[in-house]
């Protein structure tokens, strides 16, 4: 677009008189006349040849500048060849000078010539001949001068004729500037163009409707003294819920979807998921549906999968192990794990409770990604009821029934709980007595006690056991100087306890020379 | 404004002299050459030549040369056209015209009254 | 020397119709020549020059035209006033008139 140029004058598209100023007013004259097109122009002319050391003046009005600071003057000239008047050749001359004067406001009709400042002295590329009158297209002279930077308000140009013989076919005063564009989203309004001729003027650029600036990254151009955009820097993007149609940013339609300024695009809604308005940033879910806190928005709403199948128990004692195949449905996930709830359920109206913090599970009560799960520390002969649930990412959003496997079991006799409070009640050189108190829980009657032992470096690689049925005991025949582990268990019909924790000993040294040895107190004699 | 005066109407003899003036008024007299055309009874118009106002440099056209002589007096802004030896056939209106030299032509732009020479014996 | 013919001699045109008046040049011309009316008992008026350049206060309705050998005077809308004798003028070196026209009422 030629547009860059903001005119301040024209006088080509003048049709009425243009009344500059002429002094003398002999000197320049207008004239209307045709153009090349046979458009009626208003031109002035000069041609004074006869006559030595012409000094004619043509000043046009008064020019505002509007905010510009560089100024273009086009120049649209003809110039008749000296050669071509007949008579003249000592006085006529073939170049004019340019001028300007700057000032604030409109000085009025006179000329002061000395305030003026030339710009140039103006030379036809072309002149033209006798030869040349019949044409209609005649050697017209083109030539574009700039004045600037300016400090007024306006200025005047003015023409010096000094004898030549020249039609000033068009003058346009113009200034350049980058005219408002929308580049990567930003919109950059226009700007004049710099003072310098190789001034850059930076310009910010505002976001399109519905975009935001791309993080750390602000749009910038820059408008050349040619009033040009040069590269941009920086972009708009738009925002969440838009997307780029040329130089907007449209909403997107109803079932899509754009979660982010960084996506390119709005997509499809995901399944399961819908948007029924326009510029939607993240589609809602179906009913029934639902999207875990960490899911991201391009993924399908899911569901609590369905509940296990194929649940199986197996019983041994005070222990359960139970065991399911996953389950139907997923949900559309594959973050299921599975979580066990334990109820102990009374033998007559069937009213069950949690069952307490006593039991074990293993591996885990909750989380488990395996489909089997050990339950111990059960009471014995008590009815029971396990739910086995299949959770996934969004179970804990759902207001809807939990969907479970269900088994109900009665445990059998339990073996005792483990011994507790085991001391060494004397220590001598070849025998250890120890104490210990009866588990909390025999769970039935403890039918004898088991104690184990080993030497401590032996590493259980061979060991000793001695049977009682009392809470203490002497074990005898023991090594001199030696540090023993015992262990000790009860035993009932159902079967036996766990093993007290490690206990260590140390015999005493052989003392040099014969000793008093004390018999230990035992309900019963180790069996060698 | 503008404008050539010349004098009243001429009756000659033949073989005498006549020298019509043109005086200019309203512009810079130097700064314009000054044409002469002779119009004969029920005739057209024929350019006799014409004279450059600021060196005095005459030019004559094709039949004008000899008898006829271009001057000035530039103190007084006269263009003089003189006719020696007249003849019956220089019987005529004559007229001074100024020259307008422009970029794009030329022409005869402000013109004498026209002054009338009868040739008669 | 380069001779002028016009034609015709007499155009009889009635007030309001568009007149157009021819002026062969007896060889190719470069320059477009002048054209002036004259009236009974005055001296002529200098009405175009260059082809494009109406003189001072010389109405739009007068125009001219051509190039080469034929050049045409046209009256858009004859006037009353403009019943006259109109003559082309070439110039150059040498410079001469054509024998005219007269425009008359029809």
């Known amino acids: 677009q030629a547009a860059k140029e903001v005119l301040l004058l024209d006088s080509k598209a003048q049709q009425t008189e243009l009344e500059w100023i002429s002094s003398p007013p002999s000197g320049w004259e207008e004239i209307s006349g045709l153009d090349e097109n046979y458009t009626p122009i208003r031109t002035y002319q000069v041609c004074q040849v006869m006559e030595p050391n012409q000094n004619n003046w043509l000043r046009t009005n008064w020019i505002s500048k509007g905010n510009a600071q560089r100024i273009f003057v086009e120049l649209k000239f003809t110039l008749r060849d000296c050669n071509s008047l007949p008579g003249v050749l000592g006085t006529c001359k073939e170049t004019f000078n340019l001028y300007y004067y700057e000032t604030d406001y409109d000085t009025g009709r006179n000329i002061r010539e000395n305030l003026y400042v030339k710009i140039d002295t103006i030379a036809a590329d072309e002149s033209f001949t006798q030869g040349d009158l019949g044409e209609r297209k005649m050697k017209l002279n083109t030539e574009v001068r700039e004045i600037g930077p300016l400090s007024k308000k306006g200025f005047y140009l003015a023409f010096q004729d000094v004898g030549a013989c020249i039609a000033l076919v068009s003058v346009k005063v113009y200034y350049k500037k980058c005219w408002s564009i929308v580049e990567n989203l930003a919109v950059f309004p226009d700007t004049v163009t710099g003072s310098e001729f190789s001034s850059l003027v930076e310009v910010r650029g505002t976001c399109v409707s519905s975009a935001e600036e791309e993080a750390e990254n602000s749009p910038r151009m820059h408008c050349s003294a040619e009033g040009e955009w040069l590269v941009p820097i920086g972009k708009c993007i738009c925002k969440a819920g838009y997307q780029q149609k040329g130089d907007t940013c449209e909403p997107c339609g109803r079932r899509f979807y754009k979660s982010s300024s960084q996506d390119l695009q709005c997509s499809r809604c995901p399944t399961h998921s819908f948007s029924d308005r326009e510029g939607s940033s993240r589609c809602e879910c179906e009913d029934g549906y639902y999207r875990a806190p960490s899911d991201p928005p391009y993924v399908a709403c899911t569901r609590p999968p369905s509940a296990p199948q194929n649940l199986i128990f197996n019983i041994n004692q005070t222990t359960v192990s139970l065991e399911w195949s996953p389950p139907a449905d997923n949900g559309g996930r594959n973050d299921v794990t599975y979580r066990i709830l334990c109820k102990r359920c009374s033998w007559e109206q069937g009213e069950c409770v949690p069952c307490g913090s006593n039991i074990g599970y293993m591996p885990q009560q909750t989380g488990l990604e395996d489909n089997y799960v050990t339950v111990m520390d059960l009471l014995a002969h008590a009815n029971y009821t396990f739910e086995v649930e299949a959770v996934n990412g969004v179970s804990d959003l759902s207001r809807s029934q939990r969907l479970f496997a269900a088994v109900s079991i009665t445990t059998g006799q339990a073996a005792p709980s483990q011994v507790s409070g085991v001391m060494k009640e004397r220590v001598l050189q070849r025998s250890v007595q120890l104490s210990w108190q009866e588990p909390e829980h025999p769970n039935g009657v403890i039918t004898e006690y088991e104690i184990k032992y080993y030497e401590k470096d032996q590493r259980e690689r061979t060991y000793s056991t001695l049977k009682t049925k009392s809470t203490s005991a002497s074990i005898n025949n023991l090594k001199p100087g030696t540090v023993y582990v015992f262990q000790i268990r009860a035993v009932t019909a159902a079967g036996y306890g766990n093993y007290s924790p490690r206990l260590d000993v140390a015999t005493l040294e052989e003392a040099s020379g014969k000793m008093f040895e004390a018999t230990a107190v035992s309900s019963e004699q180790n069996p060698v | 404004q503008v404008q050539l005066l010349q004098s009243g109407a001429e009756v000659k003899k033949p073989g005498a002299s006549v020298k019509v003036p043109c005086k200019a008024s309203g512009y810079t007299f130097t700064s314009r050459a000054m044409s002469w055309v002779r119009q004969a009874p029920g005739q057209g118009l024929e350019w006799m030549g014409w004279?450059?106002?600021?060196?005095?440099?005459?030019t004559y056209a094709q039949g004008f040369t000899g008898r006829f002589v271009f001057s000035l007096d530039t103190s007084v802004s006269t263009a003089y056209l003189q006719i020696s030896s007249l003849k019956a056939e220089d019987t005529a209106v004559y007229y001074c015209?100024?020259?307008?030299?422009?970029?794009?032509?030329?022409?005869?732009?402000?013109w004498g009254q026209g002054t009338l020479v009868t040739v008669s014996s | 020397e380069i001779v002028l013919t016009q034609s015709p001699a007499t155009l009889s045109v009635s007030p309001g119709e568009r007149a157009t008046l021819s002026c062969r040049a007896s060889q190719s011309v470069s320059s477009n020549p002048a054209w002036y009316q004259q009236k009974p008992g005055q001296a002529p008026r200098l009405l175009i020059y260059g082809a494009s350049t109406w003189a001072t206060g010389i109405p739009d309705r007068f125009s001219a035209s051509g190039s080469g050998t034929d050049f045409t005077l046209t009256i858009s809308r004859v006037e009353p006033e403009d019943f006259a004798v109109y003559y082309c003028q070439q110039y150059g070196p040498s410079w001469t008139f054509g024998q005219g026209t007269k425009v008359e009422i029809k």
């Open positions: 004279i450059n106002t600021n060196t005095g440099n005459p």
């Open positions: 015209a100024r020259v307008r030299f422009t970029v794009y032509g030329d022409g005869m732009d402000v």
